[in-house]
Each structure stands twice: as structure tokens, then as C-alpha cells.
């Protein structure tokens, strides 16, 4: 039992410490500007980021990653015609 | 035949509302990202926005806040609704299958 | 965000001539995810050219693109009476989506 219950804080631990380094990529990105002014669904707005929302900072920088993946992909399949790249997840909604 | 066919346009007063459809026929649209484009009378194209398969849309950021895209995947139609229309937003809006194939548009005037 | 400029606006041109319009970018083009469009008045849009010089499947041979990063052409070497229409460039833009060209009209001399 002693040795699950290690397996059990382990894998807590490394999921902590997965979040943690996801963190820093997504400051990193907030550093690099990364995002733009492209909409997302409504109640998306994108705010200015400023020291004093640090606590959104993650949520905010992560939102407009995904909305950059999401358009690269649309380029790709529809002004590229890279058919391979188009979302498929029908089963979705 | 495969084809779009927009509908829902017409007259309607600034600051009104209005949904459009986009009908699909004889093609499965489900797995498709759909897009919205308009074309204000005598002018170029302008983009609005796009729905992925997965129902998630992005639009333009002139859009965003007053443009909303949705879709049905089990009515095989994708709509737009505007809100808080102005006189600008007189045109001709298109709905594309990606952007090879398109509607034959539907008008929407914006007037008093 | 990026603004497609295409030249010339207007071009007067005869059956069988060689005929290039420009579209000029601000920036880059992402991917160089480039088309080109062909509309008839009271029409949809028709997709002719994808990825700069890709002719899309049915358009004739005639059609060409060219370029790459900020300068692309559409060229039809050899102009026939169905040509005569409005050509629009759309390039991807990863902060605005799509962004189109003020158009060419193409008109018979």
C-alpha cells in the first residue's frame, strides 16, 4: 500500500510540475506578443495583459495560442488546400 | 448538384438583428470549415469569419461581438447572425465550403 | 495586420492578350497561402489559383500564379471572352484570418 500511495504522490507531483513548466512556456509566449487581434468565440474579448491580471495571464496567452493554431490550420486547408490539416472532430458537438 | 444557398436577407433597421442560413446540398458539410464573406454593393470582398467541424469560430476582429457563426451539423447548415446592424453592413454576404465552393449570397440592407 | 494591394485596379485588354495583375503585400504572407479569385457581376466568387501557383482542378491552363512573400502575379496568357470578369487576391493572415485584395476588373479594350 506504501508503495501505491508513493505512486499516487508521484504522479501529483509530476503533473504539478508538468503544469508549472507549462507556465513558463505560456509566459513566454505572452513575452513574445504571440496572438493577435483575429476574434475568437463571443466573451473572448482580448484585454491588454498587465502585472495586475498576472492570475489570467496563463488562461489569456493559452486562449490566443489556440486561436492562432486554429487559424494556421484554416489557411492551411483552405488557401493551401492541405485537406489532411482540416478539423475532423465531428463527434465534437 | 452540390451547392450553397444562402437565405435571410433583406431590409432591416440599424440597430436590428438578423440570422442568415447557409444550406447545403448534395455534400456533407460536417467536416468542413465553413466561412463567411461579404461584399458591400460595388466594392471588394471582406472577410468575416469561419466555423471549424468542431464548432468553434473565429471571425475578424471588425466582427467579433456582433457577428456570431454557428452551425448544424444535423440540418447540414451553417448560419451567421448579426446584431447591432449599421448602414456599413449593407452587402452581399456569401457563405463558402472552405473557400472553393460558394453560395450565390443573400442581400442585406441596412436602412431607416 | 496585412493589406493586399493589387494593380493595376482597372486593365483594358483584347481577346488572346497576355494579361499579369499584382498583388502587393504589406507583410509576408503566412505559408504563402496566396489565391486568386475570378468574379462575375452578380456572382460568387470562383477559385481559380491556391498556395501562390497551384491551379485549383478545372480551371484551364491559361491561368498561372507567381510569387512569393510580399509580390505575387496572376498571369492569363492568352485572353479569351470568358476571362473578362474582376480578379481578387486573398492571403492569409494569422491576426485577421483572411485579407483580400481591392480587385482587378479586367475589361475588353
Known amino acids: 500500500r506504501r508503495d501505491v500511495a508513493h505512486g499516487i504522490l508521484n504522479e501529483a507531483y509530476r503533473k504539478v510540475l508538468d503544469q508549472l513548466s507549462a507556465g513558463k512556456h505560456l509566459q513566454s509566449l505572452v513575452a513574445r506578443g504571440v496572438g493577435g487581434s483575429l476574434g475568437g468565440g463571443a466573451g473572448d474579448d482580448a484585454e491588454p495583459l498587465s502585472k495586475r491580471h498576472s492570475d489570467g495571464i496563463f488562461t489569456d496567452s493559452y486562449s490566443r495560442y489556440r486561436k492562432q493554431m486554429a487559424v494556421k490550420k484554416y489557411l492551411a486547408a483552405v488557401l493551401g488546400k492541405r485537406y489532411k490539416q482540416r478539423v475532423k472532430n465531428k463527434g465534437r458537438r | 448538384e452540390v451547392q450553397l444557398v444562402e437565405s435571410g436577407g433583406g431590409l432591416v433597421q440599424p440597430g436590428g438583428s438578423l440570422r442568415l442560413s447557409c444550406a447545403a446540398s448534395?455534400?456533407?458539410?460536417?467536416?468542413?470549415?465553413m466561412t463567411w464573406v461579404r461584399q458591400a454593393p460595388g466594392k471588394g470582398l471582406e472577410w468575416i469569419g469561419f466555423?471549424?467541424?468542431?464548432?468553434?469560430?473565429y471571425y475578424a476582429s471588425w466582427a467579433k461581438g456582433r457577428f456570431t457563426i454557428s452551425r448544424d451539423n444535423s440540418k447540414n447548415t451553417v448560419y451567421l447572425q448579426m446584431n447591432s446592424l449599421r448602414a456599413e453592413d449593407t452587402a452581399v454576404y456569401f457563405c463558402?465550403?472552405?473557400?472553393?465552393?460558394w453560395g450565390q449570397g443573400t442581400l442585406v440592407t441596412v436602412s431607416s | 495586420d496585412i493589406q493586399l494591394t493589387q494593380s493595376p485596379s482597372t486593365l483594358s485588354a483584347s481577346v488572346g492578350d497576355r494579361v499579369t495583375i499584382t498583388c502587393q503585400s504589406s507583410?509576408?504572407?503566412?505559408?504563402?497561402?496566396l489565391a486568386w479569385f475570378q468574379q462575375k457581376p452578380g456572382k460568387a466568387p470562383k477559385f481559380l489559383i491556391y498556395?501562390?501557383?497551384k491551379l485549383e482542378s478545372g480551371v484551364p491552363s491559361r491561368f498561372s500564379g507567381s510569387g512569393s512573400g510580399t509580390e505575387f502575379t496572376l498571369t492569363i496568357s492568352s485572353l479569351q471572352p470568358d476571362d473578362f470578369a474582376t480578379y481578387y487576391c486573398?492571403?492569409?493572415?494569422?491576426?485577421?484570418?483572411?485579407?483580400f485584395g481591392g480587385g482587378t476588373k479586367v475589361e475588353i479594350k
Open positions: 466555423i471549424d467541424a468542431g464548432g468553434d469560430a
Open positions: 463558402a465550403r472552405d473557400l472553393d465552393l
Open positions: 498556395e501562390a501557383s
Open positions: 448534395g455534400i456533407d458539410l460536417n467536416s468542413y470549415y
Open positions: 486573398a492571403g492569409g493572415d494569422i491576426s485577421e484570418g483572411v485579407a
Open positions: 507583410e509576408s504572407v503566412y505559408g504563402n497561402y
